[in-house]
Interface confidence: low
């Protein structure tokens, strides 16, 4: 790397991936292994984030950008930049202070994270329930009863795979 020549701030010419090394007459030195500088003019390089244990490496650290982590199976990311991993539950459950709990009747969760949400109220939109909701799936709303012409065969929704509501503990 060339010695910088700016009279005002010799460090300003040091590009990303380097740091301005005061110990070596302000020469732009490359970031050491496992460190990076994402902007120019840095006087130090930042230590790369290590994705260990519950964290899994999504993007390796480079001399100009930090590593990015996600979560190992059984966990999901929380917070900016996946600063935390929270334990998963199953679909049809939500994480509470007493562990993973089944969604109450009338609610569902189609993900391994987050909370149980109420089924859609089809009648609010003037529609009817086409497919019943379960703990894992929202109801499917169909056309309003008025939309069904007289004598038209009504669709019989399939029975849910299992009865929605709490399973015995």
């Amino acid at each position: 790397f060339e010695r910088t020549r700016s009279l005002q701030d010799p460090c300003s010419n040091c590009p990303a991936g380097t740091f301005c090394d005061n110990n070596r007459n302000q020469i732009c030195s490359p970031c050491p292994p496992n460190s990076f500088s994402s902007a120019g003019g840095q006087r130090t390089c930042d230590i790369c984030r290590q994705c260990k244990g519950v964290f899994r490496t999504r993007k390796e650290c480079s001399s100009t950008s930090n590593a990015e982590c996600d979560c190992t199976p059984g966990f999901h990311c929380l917070g900016a930049g996946c600063s935390m991993c929270e334990q998963d539950c199953k679909q049809g459950q939500e994480l509470t202070k007493k562990g993973c709990k089944d969604c109450c009747f009338g609610t569902f969760n189609d993900q391994k994270r987050g909370i149980c949400r109420p089924w859609t109220n089809c009648s609010l939109d003037g529609k009817s329930v086409l497919v019943n909701g379960t703990k894992e799936r929202d109801v499917v709303c169909g056309p309003s009863p008025a939309d069904l012409s007289p004598g038209a065969s009504s669709v019989t929704p399939p029975a849910p795979a299992r009865e929605p509501g709490h399973s015995p503990q």
Partner: antibody, heavy 113, light 110 residues
Framework: SVEESGGRLVKPDESLTLTCTAS????????MTWVRQAPGKGLEYIGF?????DTSYASWSKGRFTISKASTTVDLKISSLTTEDTATYFC???????????WGPGTLVTVSS | AQVLTQTPSPVSAAVGGTVTINCQSS????????LSWYQQKPGQPPKRLIY???DLASGVPSRFKGSGSGTQFTLTISDLECDDAATYYC??????????FGGGTEVEFK
Amino acid sequence: SVEESGGRLVKPDESLTLTCTASGFSLSHYWMTWVRQAPGKGLEYIGFINVGGDTSYASWSKGRFTISKASTTVDLKISSLTTEDTATYFCGRGGLTFGWDLWGPGTLVTVSS
Amino acid sequence: AQVLTQTPSPVSAAVGGTVTINCQSSQSVYSNSFLSWYQQKPGQPPKRLIYSASDLASGVPSRFKGSGSGTQFTLTISDLECDDAATYYCAGVYSDNTYVFGGGTEVEFK
């Protein structure tokens, strides 16, 4: 409730499987952990298994200890036993977020030649 | 490796008094608050008292109070009763998914 079983007197280098039986709750709702306590010593975390069956171990227990589960039981397999493994082994219910809220009475493993 | 250091041990107490048990972590626990406290009596399994540093577990008397964040945590037991004689453990969760118990603090009565 949870209850451990399978503890007994074993010889060094043998293997042993301990079983934790869960009743009154579903293992699909709770994470389960194994912890041990040598005579007169403190509690020592071994590892856990989560609702999806994923496992995690303390750095010292990786390799020799294996946690698995069935519908109502959680097993801890210990291989290549040494006298240092002599301890009471506890099974606990809960999770990392909120701690372990329900424990069994423990099962004693004695390793001696 | 992460270490949780508990002080003092043992601690001598008087019925009706207050004891404070400190738990210092060699590095910040997960989310600065993933720390639990357990009570254990001889021949019994641990009993969860506190989780998330300060939340009281169900069925635990409000005489037990947890506080702290990051690397410094405290369990305070007030209005001590004879039944509180036990060993108390802190336990922390760390970002690498490690779960660590402290060495334990024995509470005994004068």
